[in-house]
């Protein structure tokens, strides 16, 4: 239904707290360099204006679209051109082009320092002094570093943060209470960020149809007792919510997500038997819980699908009459039978089925042509299953750090032109798949591994798009989203690469490494490992292990030495010489 004032409508629906949080996220995601104070001032102005519209929907400018109102605010910021360069050109455009322009200038890798967590006492002091400002800072800092973070979900993480601080700041040992809990929230939020970025990439590159197919597969796996009409309705609504968030329409997105959660809870009987626990929670927790609710129990006696999709004489007729509905039904029926497959795999199977029908329904004898289509799925299914087995076996043998190193070597060989920081970040993230997925029950491993890897590789593609350097990466990133992971897995050593010359300074370390936290030490060592592979792309695993063991021993010795600086300056060059010899 149309409202006289869109801003008043959203303010009323969302309430002041969520309204302000979402506006802050929107501004922080669009203008990523502005300070918290600058954004907080804008948010207050927008909120005050919204309140005037709530009081009188006919007041001046209350009928303007949210894009117009927000865009005008952003464009009124002083020194926009000095701070943001060509993004200022967006302000010369009219809506909707202006908003599209802002979206195109979102930076997936902004040059901002890492978000450092203050020490416990300082955190608790500022939290107690002003919880609202403290949470505002959290939203601002996360949103500007993750310009596609799912806004209503970021409000959920802020709420978690708030609850942890409320609990831990009352304890004697604040540090040991806060650290593990906040680390847990950070890890979950980072995974949420890459997953959502993947959804927005799907929407941006391949449109709503691609996202809706993803949603049908995912929802059919989770709700195998819901009928196709119900799954289609949920997928359509979920597509709208994600389209809005990916498009910067955060107030609409959060409002529609709340509506979808309400609908699901009012229709549990036709959706799933597992929703009640989620539905008993308050809004943000409820929507989060529904998004990762456990799969409902599969129906006991689902028949094979060959009868409807291969053996039926009307297959081509049914397909021709309503292609998307027929393919949607196929995807639904296949997915509800296979919660043990990744969504990416299910979409590859549906794509293969579609390609087969396109080809066969144009032939003289279609049934003879498409009769073997389901059997032809076997290699597509076996490939990711083998990937999971091989990688989980390796993870179990090496542990997380060793597994990351194995991936780092593999990916540096595949794409040695990619910058070392990007390779290290990618390998560390890809390596976490072991800890995240390999400990799960067998039927949950494949969906966990492949869908997580796909999301991480999407980030690799986004970073590479900014500065394309590797033909291998460009090739894998240009294809369809669901083919990316198999494409990257199939890459081998890049034979076109001319090895980097050996630079001693790349492998020269100083005593300051000794005081770094363990994570930073690992990154330094992994940076050296990637550089070694760039110098010798065809080095064997044994050679690289020898060098890395020697390197670890060197760090251990010098960091324990009485005179660390002398140890580093005398033993360092010897290490470099030994490395060169080992790789010769």
């Amino acid at each position: 239904e149309a409202h006289k004032s869109e801003i008043a409508h959203r303010y009323n629906d969302l309430g002041e707290q969520h309204f302000k949080g979402l506006v802050l996220i929107a501004f922080s995601q669009y203008l990523q360099k502005c300070s918290y104070d600058e954004h907080a001032k804008l948010v207050q102005e927008v909120t005050d204006f919204a309140k005037t519209c709530v009081a009188d929907e006919s007041a001046a400018n209350c009928d303007k679209s949210l894009h117009t109102l927000f865009g005008d605010k952003l464009c009124a910021i002083p020194n926009l051109r000095e701070n943001y360069g060509e993004l200022a050109d967006c302000c010369t455009k009219q809506e909707p082009e202006r908003n599209e322009c802002f979206l195109q200038h979102k930076d997936d890798n902004p040059s901002l320092p890492p978000f450092e967590r203050p020490e416990a006492e300082a955190m608790c002091t500022s939290f107690k002094e002003n919880p609202t400002t403290f949470m505002g800072h959290y939203l601002h800092e996360v949103a500007r570093r993750h310009p596609y973070f799912y806004a209503p979900e970021l409000l959920y993480y802020a709420e978690q943060y708030n609850e942890i601080l409320t609990q831990c700041c009352a304890e004697a040992d604040k540090e040991s209470c806060l650290t593990p809990k906040l680390d847990g929230v950070k890890e979950k939020a980072l995974v949420s960020s890459v997953r959502q970025r993947m959804k927005c990439s799907s929407m941006q590159k391949f449109g709503e149809r691609a996202f809706k197919a993803w949603a049908v597969a995912r929802l059919s796996q989770t709700f195998p007792n819901a009928d196709f009409a119900e799954i289609t309705k949920l997928a359509t609504d979920l597509t709208k919510v994600n389209k809005e968030c990916c498009h910067g329409d955060l107030l609409e997105c959060a409002d529609d997500r709340a509506e979808l959660a309400k609908y699901m809870c009012e229709n549990q009987a036709t959706i799933s038997s597992k929703l009640q626990t989620c539905c008993d929670k308050p809004l943000l927790k409820k929507a989060h819980c529904l998004s990762e609710v456990e799969h409902d129990t599969m129906p006991a006696d689902l028949p094979a699908i060959a009868a409807d999709f291969v053996e039926d004489q009307e297959v081509c007729k049914n397909y021709a009459e309503a292609k998307d509905v027929f393919l949607g039904t196929f995807l639904y029926e296949y997915s509800r039978r296979h919660p043990d497959y990744s969504v990416s795999l299910l979409l590859r199977l549906a794509k293969k089925y579609e390609a087969t029908l396109e080809k066969c329904c144009a032939e003289a004898n279609p049934p003879a042509c498409y009769g073997t289509v389901l059997a032809e799925f076997q290699p597509l299914v076996e490939e990711p299953k083998n990937l999971v087995k091989t990688n989980c076996d390796l993870y179990e043998k090496l542990g997380e750090y060793g597994f990351q190193n194995a991936i780092l070597v593999r990916y540096t060989q595949k794409a040695p032109q990619v910058s070392t920081p990007t390779l290290v970040e990618a390998a560390r993230n890809l390596g976490r798949v072991g800890t995240k997925c390999c400990t799960l029950p067998e039927d949950q491993r494949l969906p966990c591994v492949e869908d997580y890897l796909s999301a991480i590789l999407n980030r690799v593609c986004l970073l590479h798009e900014k500065t394309p350097v590797s033909e291998h990466v460009t090739k894998c990133c240009s294809g369809s989203l669901v083919e990316r992971r198999p494409c990257f897995s199939a890459l081998t050593v890049d034979e076109t690469y001319v090895p980097k010359e050996f630079k001693a300074e790349t492998f020269t370390f100083h005593s300051d490494i000794c005081t770094l936290p363990e994570k930073e030490k690992q990154i330094k060592k992994q940076t050296a490992l990637a550089e070694l592979v760039k110098h010798k792309p065809k080095a064997t695993a044994e050679q690289l292990k020898t060098v890395m063991d020697d390197f670890a021993q060197f760090l251990d010795t010098c960091c324990k030495a009485a005179d660390k600086d002398t140890c580093f300056s005398t033993e360092g060059p010897n290490l470099v010489t030994r490395c060169k010899d080992a790789l010769a």
Epitope: L302, A304, Q378, D443
Partner: nanobody, 115 residues
């Protein structure tokens, strides 16, 4: 060609136990359902127990608490442990394994419960 072979049937006294096994030979992949059905003389074939790919189990009301279905994924095997057997459990028991492409049935194994 996929073949299913059931074993473990036989004659047992009321209150006794049997363990049925079913093994699949040939290339069957992408299994999403394994089940045991039974057919008593003059009656329709009925589902006794099934186990889906996610590990969910389903039992007919008449066997709940007495029968347990389990599987060994690596060997494509499915088992039915039957305890506290009754005369009305007498039937031919069939194993059924399903993937999206088809429904594969064994020849059946006779279970007779009689004193």
């Amino acid at each position: 060609q996929v073949q299913l072979v059931e074993s473990g049937g036989g004659l047992v006294q009321p209150g006794g136990s049997l363990r049925l096994s079913c093994s699949a030979s040939g290339s069957i992949w992408g299994i999403y359902h394994m089940g045991w059905y039974r057919q008593a003389p003059g009656k329709q074939r009925e589902l006794v127990a099934s186990i889906t790919v996610d590990g969910s189990t389903h039992y007919a009301d008449t066997v709940k608490g007495r029968f347990t279905i389990s599987r060994d994924n690596s060997k494509n095997m499915v088992y039915l442990q039957m305890n506290s057997l009754r005369a009305e459990d007498t039937a031919v028991y069939y194993c059924d394994i399903r993937n999206v492409g088809g429904d594969y049935w064994g020849q059946g194994t006779q279970v007779t419960v009689s004193s």
